[in-house]
């Protein structure tokens, strides 16, 4: 059993400075080139080694870019989005959505908050069951008094 894969979504403002080879990443997506089904958003497909984005370190492959210099990237054709990046100037402000994959279940990665690696529901279910049994026993005992 693989467990369920969830995503932790965070947003970040990233200010990038254009380098000799541009901003140093490639994009996919757009209304005419959907990268994710039912989502015409713009995504980072590749970060170029030694480029501006790679050396900055914050942008990651798979990130969704929500805006460039405050301009929303919703409902844009792919080429229009490309042009927007190309004409964005020297210092570029990107609003970015990171999606961190979090796996729940038996083979989930052991995170800092879960040192034993036991999924939280496996702890909560027995605790809840014991509480219910105790409550039922108490109520029954009270009725006998």
């Amino acid at each position: 059993m693989n467990g369920r894969v969830d995503y932790l979504v965070t947003e970040e403002e990233i200010n990038l400075t254009r380098g000799p080879s541009g901003l140093g990443f490639n994009i996919v997506g757009g209304t005419d080139q959907q990268y994710v089904s039912n989502d015409s958003g713009i995504y980072v497909s590749r970060i170029k080694e030694n480029g501006a984005a790679a050396l900055d370190g914050r942008l990651q492959e798979g990130d969704k870019i929500l805006s460039v210099n405050g301009q929303d990237l919703k409902n844009l054709l792919h080429q229009d989005a490309v042009d927007l990046f190309r004409n964005a100037g020297y210092a570029v402000s990107l609003r970015v959505q990171h999606r961190l994959q979090v796996q729940n279940g038996p083979i989930g990665h052991r995170g800092e908050g879960d040192p034993s690696g036991i999924p939280i529901f496996m702890v909560l279910v027995p605790v809840f069951a014991l509480t219910m049994v105790a409550a039922w026993a108490f109520m029954r005992y009270r009725q006998q008094l």
């Epitope: 970060i47 984005a53 790679a54 050396l55 370190g57 990651q60």
Partner: nanobody
């Protein structure tokens, strides 16, 4: 064990210069960056970074022409030359490194204080 040790910080008058050093040990890195944190409640921001292999550099627009990042492979050290310093450059400067070519920096130094009066 990975270690990044910064040095060279201190108090300097406006208009002056400082050279920060970051001595790296424990492994070969792909990238090394210098970050600054002007106040504890503010986040660390990259000011300059360098590719260990190619020597390609990156600067944020507000320090380009003022700061210079360089590396000495023989000494396993990365430098940040800071010129024409202003009070706005006052911050704790951190060295960070990664053995991956992209993504977040995984290793951090303890930081060195730079104060411009």
């Amino acid at each position: 064990d990975v270690q990044l040790v910064e040095s060279g910080g201190g108090l300097v008058q406006a208009g002056g210069s400082l050279r920060l050093s970051c001595a790296a040990s424990g492994r070969t890195f792909s990238r090394v960056g210098w970050f600054h944190q002007p106040a504890p409640e503010k986040r660390r921001e990259v000011v300059a970074a360098i590719s260990w292999r190619s020597g390609d550099t990156y600067y944020t627009h507000f320090v380009e022409g003022q700061f210079t990042i360089s590396r000495d492979n023989a000494k396993n050290t990365v430098y940040l030359q800071m010129n024409s310093l202003t009070p706005e450059d006052t911050a704790v400067y951190y060295c960070a490194a990664s053995d991956k070519s992209t993504g977040p920096y995984e290793y951090w130094g303890q930081g060195t204080q730079v104060t411009v009066s």
